[in-house]
């Protein structure tokens, strides 16, 4: 890391070190030999989240309902607004600039992890002994019915998409 001419939270201007403006404030004028750095608070719709020498504050992010967005956390003078997606939708990127519907798990697949405002549904194939016969964003793979516990026998084997079919035991002897 190269040497710096100033302390942390200072910047070099005109061969002297001036104090940076604290988070939530913007630079109005650099320090001089006789005056300190002049800073002003950001307005209500703006923010700056670091020690800085910015002459303009950044606008808070707008959570556009037309894109399925809603406010998760209102911005302050030091933090940006955090957007999240409405129910049934999730963000398309980490910065959450738009939303898309949660995906459904097709028959033969179950929900491993239910979607959130920031992550999509995670599906998994139903293993042997489990099935899913619906397309769903919530349903997990369900276990095949246990015919034995009902005093029945398997008449039709289950698959990853269908349950077993149970029937009465054949009581006739050969």
């Amino acid at each position: 890391e190269p040497p710096t001419a100033c302390r942390e939270k200072q910047y070099l201007i005109n061969s002297q070190c001036c104090s940076l403006c604290q988070p939530g404030q913007k630079l109005v004028s650099d320090c001089t030999e006789f005056t300190e750095t002049e800073c002003l608070p950001c307005s209500e719709s703006e923010f700056l989240d670091t020690w800085n020498r910015e002459t303009r504050c950044h606008q808070h992010k707008y959570c556009d309902p037309n894109l399925g967005l809603q406010v998760q956390q209102k911005g302050t003078s030091e933090t940006d607004t955090i957007c999240t997606c409405e129910e049934g939708l999730h963000c398309t990127s980490e910065s959450c600039e738009s939303c898309v519907p949660h995906r459904s798990c097709l028959p033969g697949f179950g929900v491993k992890q239910i979607a959130t405002g920031v992550s999509d549904t995670i599906c998994e194939p139903c293993p042997v002994g489990f099935f899913s016969n619906v397309s769903s964003a919530f349903e997990k793979c369900r276990p095949w019915t246990s015919c034995e516990t009902k005093d029945l026998v398997v008449q039709q084997a289950g698959t990853n998409k269908t349950d077993v079919v149970c029937g009465p035991q054949d009581r006739q002897r050969a």
């Epitope: 100033c6 942390e8 061969s15 002297q16 070190c17 320090c31 001089t32 030999e33 300190e36």
Partner: antibody, heavy 126, light 107 residues
Amino acid sequence: QVQLVQSGAEVKKPGASVKVSCKASGYTFTGKYMHWVRQAPGQGLEWMGWINPDSGGTNYAQKFQGRVTMTRDTSIATAYMELNRLRSDDTAVYYCARDQPLGYCTNGVCSYFDYWGQGTLVTVSS
Amino acid sequence: DIQMTQSPSSVSASVGDRVTITCRASQGIYSWLAWYQQKPGKAPNLLIYTASTLQSGVPSRFSGSGSGTDFTLTISSLQPEDFATYYCQQANIFPLTFGGGTKVEIK
């Protein structure tokens, strides 16, 4: 009262490394930058760099870049200066020095040293 | 880097004399200058900072002046304990730099 107590004298061979410690007491260690200054025998004072004990941030003089490492352990209020690849012209007394806490500093880095360690003599000789 | 040039490099004086040491910066440093006193085998001791502010506990016979590039340390009436080496140091920007020192010796 404020005290900076340094580790004892060291004798090292060329190419070796040395690590000098500086234990602070009598003030909030994380509240003031710690600097390292050295003085070769019969010579003047030479600034080596600083560490901010609060953040761990450092700033080294160009001359020592890549050879010096300044660290700290806030749990025991101690700053360290390690100098690698020692040469005979690194023979000097090494001082830690605390930043003077200035109430009014409009500009400039305002680094004055109001407290110094007693010094650690490092002799580099084959 | 800012070069600090001190003069004279040594001065012989008697107790009671007025002694003046000058320090010149290679570029303007406003009032960001300190003066230190160092005795043999000891760490430096801060006398003056921001060019003219006397450090707590330092006798008032020491005074500092100047701004920009030219600075002066004055000892109004030299005392036996003042025989030492004096250094100036700029505190405008890093790297901090010191003058080469002025040795005040007994005449």
